[in-house]
Amino acid sequence: QEDEDGDYEELVLALRSEEDGLAEAPEHGTTATFHRCAKDPWRLPGTYVVVLKEETHLSQSERTARRLQAQAARRGYLTKILHVFHGLLPGFLVKMSGDLLELALKLPHVDYIEEDSSVFAQSIPWNLERITPPRYRADEYQPPDGGSLVEVYLLDTSIQSDHREIEGRVMVTDFENVPEEDGTRFHRQASKCDSHGTHLAGVVSGRDAGVAKGASMRSLRVLNCQGKGTVSGTLIGLEFIRKSQLVQPVGPLVVLLPLAGGYSRVLNAACQRLARAGVVLVTAAGNFRDDACLYSPASAPEVITVGATNAQDQPVTLGTLGTNFGRCVDLFAPGEDIIGASSDCSTCFVSQSGTSQAAAHVAGIAAMMLSAEPELTLAELRQRLIHFSAKDVINEAWFPEDQRVLTPNLVAALPPSTHGAGWQLFCRTVWSAHSGPTRMATAVARCAPDEELLSCSSFSRSGKRRGERMEAQGGKLVCRAHNAFGGEGVYAIARCCLLPQANCSVHTAPPAEASMGTRVHCHQQGHVLTGCSSHWEVEDLGTHKPPVLRPRGQPNQCVGHREASIHASCCHAPGLECKVKEHGIPAPQEQVTVACEEGWTLTGCSALPGTSHVLGAYAVDNTCVVRSRDVSTTGSTSEGAVTAVAICCRSRHLAQASQELQ
C-alpha cells in the first residue's frame, strides 16, 4: 500500500562529530534518521521510539539504552527508559529531551528514531451515543454462526465484557497502555470509557448484531476514556500479542486496530512483522476524508485497511469529514449507523459510525473465513475478501477526482459459502505511490511476499510517461513505471495473483529496427503469457501503429511500438492456461475496456498502441481499462484508435484440486 518513501516528515540528523566514548561507531556512511508525525497537534515530543537494526539482540538493545542514559547524564540530562522492545522490533522507548536526539542517532545499532504521537478511535460520535431502544426489533439480518476457531484481538478502549451481547466471548487481558486524559476536569465515567471497544466487540462477535457470532475475542486497552492512545502504546500492545502467540500458539489470529494516527514508520514496521508471523491485521482507514496513505496503521501494506460505506453503498460522511480513501484502502464495509452493544447498560444497544465499525465488519468476515479454512495465508485471505466483495457499487464522485482511479470500488461481503473458492485464480490490483514530477522519477508497485506479479502497467494523468517494466528487486519481481519530461508523474500498477508452484520470468525485446513494431513471446516450453509491458526511452512515441491482432497460433506474444522495449511476463504453473482478448475502437474514445469472461481471471492489461495520447492501462476487478487523452484536446483522430488488451487466465489444476476436496 505505501512506498518506502511514504508521506511523512523525515528529519535526517547527520553524524557531525565522533561521539566520545563510543566503542562501536555506526557503519561508515550510514545515517540514522529521525521521524515525527506530519500532523503537528498529534505529536508527543519528549517520548521517542528508538528502533535498532533488525538483527539486534535484546541484550544489545538494553546496552544501547543504558549507554544513551549514561551519555545523557554526562551532559546533565535525565532520561527514562519506559520499555525495551523485543519480539517484534528491536529497540526501546525513552522519555528524554529533544536536545538528545543528535546524540541518540549516533548510538550503535540505531536504525531510526521516531517521536511518539497520538492515535485515535475511528468512530463518530464515539462517546456521544444515540441510544436506540434497549433492543432493536424484528427483521434484522442474522448472519450465520461462525468464527469459532479464530481468536480476534481488539486493541481499543476498555470494554464492558459482561454486556449481554458479548458475555463470555471477550477475555479482557491485563494489558493496558494509555495516556492520561486531556483536561483537568475530565471525569472518568465507566460507560463512556468502555463505549468504543464494547460496540466494536459487539460488531465482531455479538450474539445478535455480530458478524462472527462464534469468534472469541481478547481485548487490550490502548485507548483512554477519550478514545486517544499513542503509537508507542499500540506498539507495546502488538508486541504483547506476538509474545502471547509464541507462548501459547493457538489457531488463526485476527488483530483489529480500530484506530488511526499520522503516518508512522515504526507502527507500520511492527504491523509488517506481526503479519509476517502469520497474524491477520485489520485496521480502520481513518475518518479524515483524506488519503489513507497519510495515516497509520492504515498505510501499512500488510494490513487489511477498511473504508466505510453506508446502507446505500456510498462513502460515509462524518460531519465535515468522512471515510478515508485511496490506494492504501483495500476495501470498504458498512460503517454508518451500525447497531451494536452499548456500554450505557448491560442490555443497551446503540448505533455508531466510522471506519472502526467498517474494520470490525471485515475482522468478523475474516474470522469466519479463517474458521472455515484455518490454513489460509494473509495473501489468500485478502484476495478472497476482494473476490467476494460487491464490485462497482460505490459512487466514486464522492472521492476527489485524482483519487477515484486509485480507490477500490469494493464493499466487503460474506462469501456465499465459506468453502469451495479454492479453484479460483485470485488476482488483485496494487497501485504504487505517485512518482512525483521529476524527469527521471519512477514509481514502484509490489506484490505481497506470497503473491506472483503477473503483469505490470502504468498510468499518467498527463499522458507523459515512458511506460513500465517488470524488474527483479530483492529476489522478487516488482513493477516500475517511468515518468517523462514535462510529465506530472506516473503510477505503476501491479497485477498480483495467487499462483501456487508458479515459475515466472520476464522476456524482453529491445526496440525494433523495422517498422513492424516490437514483439516478444514466451518461448520456454509450458510457459504461458500472463502480461505485457512496454517501456521507452524517447520522450514521445510516434503515432506508429503495430498490427494489433496477433498472427494465428501465436497467442503467447506481446506486440508494441517499434521504439519501445517490450516485456512479456511468462509463467509456468500446473494447469495454467491463458488467452489474449482484445477490444479495439477505431474512433477516438477516452476509455476502452475489455473484460474476461466468467471462470477466467484477468492477469494482464495493456494498451495498443503505446502512443503518447494513451494515459495508461489498469485492471479493475476482471476488466482491463485503457484511458486516453480527451480527444477534444488532442484534436487528432488518426491516432485515436486504441485497443485494450486483456490476458485472461485460469488454472485447471486449482479446479481439479478443489473438486477432489468436495
Epitope: 434497549p134 433492543r135 434484522e140 463470555g168 466471548r169 450474539r207
Partner: antibody, heavy 115, light 107 residues
Framework: QVQLVQSGAEVKKPGASVKVSCKAS????????ISWVRQAPGQGLEWMGW????????NYAQKLQGRGTMTTDPSTSTAYMELRSLRSDDTAVYYC????????WGQGTTVTVSS | DIQMTQSPSSLSASVGDRVTITCRAS??????LNWYQQKPGKAPKLLIY???SRQSGVPSRFSGSGSGTDFTLTISSLQPEDFATYYC?????????FGQGTKVEIK
C-alpha cells in the same frame, strides 16, 4: 472447572433480611455478570435480577420493588443478593447463575420465611 | 415484559418415545432462547442455548429449533434419566423470563 458455590440454608422471620452469597471460580468473572433466580415450592423459575462483577451495574426485576440489593466483590469473586422486609411468599430456593445466558448454576440456597 | 408460554404443561411418555415441547414468545426474540432441564431438588441445567445450539456434554438426542416467536425442544428417544421438568427462557430483553415449565412423566 466452572463452579458457583452458594451459602447455606437460612430460616428468617417476616420483616427480617437475608443475604445469600455466591462464590464463582474456574473462569474470568469479569466476563460474566451473575443472575439471581428463585423458585418457590412447587412453582416455576422467577428471575430476580443481574449484577456485574466488572462495574457493579445491576438490573432488577420490577417485582422486587426496592427490597433487593445485588452486589459483587471482584477481589473474592463473590456475588451477594440481599432481600429485605421478608414475607412468607419469599420462601423459596434462591439460585445464582452465570450471566444472562445462565449456562452454569449454583446449587441453590433455601430461604424459609416463617414466624 | 415478554411472556413465554410453554405447552404442554405436562406429558406422559415411555422410554424410547419422541417427545416435543413447544415454547411461544409474546414477541419476536430472534434466537435468544435457552432450554433447561430440572430434576427434583436440583438446580436447572442448560441443555440448549441460542434456540438450537447444544450445550457441551448434552446428549445428541436433545435438539432445539425455531426462531422469532415459536420454538421447539425435541427429545428424539426418551431415556429414563430424561424424566424431569423442562423450562424455556428468553434473554432477548430484560427482564429475562421463563416459561411455566413442562413436566415429563413416565407413562
Amino acid at each position: 472447572q466452572v463452579q458457583l458455590v452458594q451459602s447455606g440454608a437460612e430460616v428468617k422471620k417476616p420483616g427480617a433480611s437475608v443475604k445469600v452469597s455466591c462464590k464463582a471460580s474456574g473462569y474470568t468473572v469479569t466476563s460474566y455478570g451473575i443472575s439471581w433466580v428463585r423458585q418457590a415450592p412447587g412453582q416455576g423459575l422467577e428471575w430476580m435480577g443481574w449484577v456485574s462483577f466488572y462495574q457493579g451495574n445491576t438490573n432488577y426485576a420490577q417485582k422486587l420493588q426496592g427490597r433487593g440489593t445485588m452486589t459483587t466483590d471482584p477481589s473474592t469473586s463473590t456475588a451477594y443478593m440481599e432481600l429485605r422486609s421478608l414475607r412468607s411468599d419469599d420462601t423459596a430456593v434462591y439460585y445464582c447463575a452465570r450471566g444472562f445466558g445462565m449456562d452454569r448454576w449454583g446449587q441453590g440456597t433455601t430461604v424459609t420465611v416463617s414466624s | 415484559d415478554i411472556q413465554m408460554t410453554q405447552s404442554p404443561s405436562s406429558l406422559s411418555a415411555s422410554v424410547g418415545d419422541r417427545v416435543t415441547i413447544t415454547c411461544r414468545a409474546s414477541q419476536n426474540i430472534n434466537s435468544w432462547l435457552n432450554w433447561y432441564q430440572q430434576k427434583p431438588g436440583k438446580a436447572p441445567k442448560l441443555l440448549i442455548y441460542g434456540a438450537s445450539s447444544r450445550q457441551s456434554g448434552v446428549p445428541s438426542r436433545f435438539s432445539g429449533s425455531g426462531s422469532g416467536t415459536d420454538f421447539t425442544l425435541t427429545i428424539s428417544s426418551l431415556q429414563p434419566e430424561d424424566f424431569a421438568t423442562y423450562y424455556c427462557q428468553q434473554w432477548f430483553d430484560v427482564p429475562t423470563t421463563f416459561g411455566q415449565g413442562t413436566k415429563v412423566e413416565i407413562k
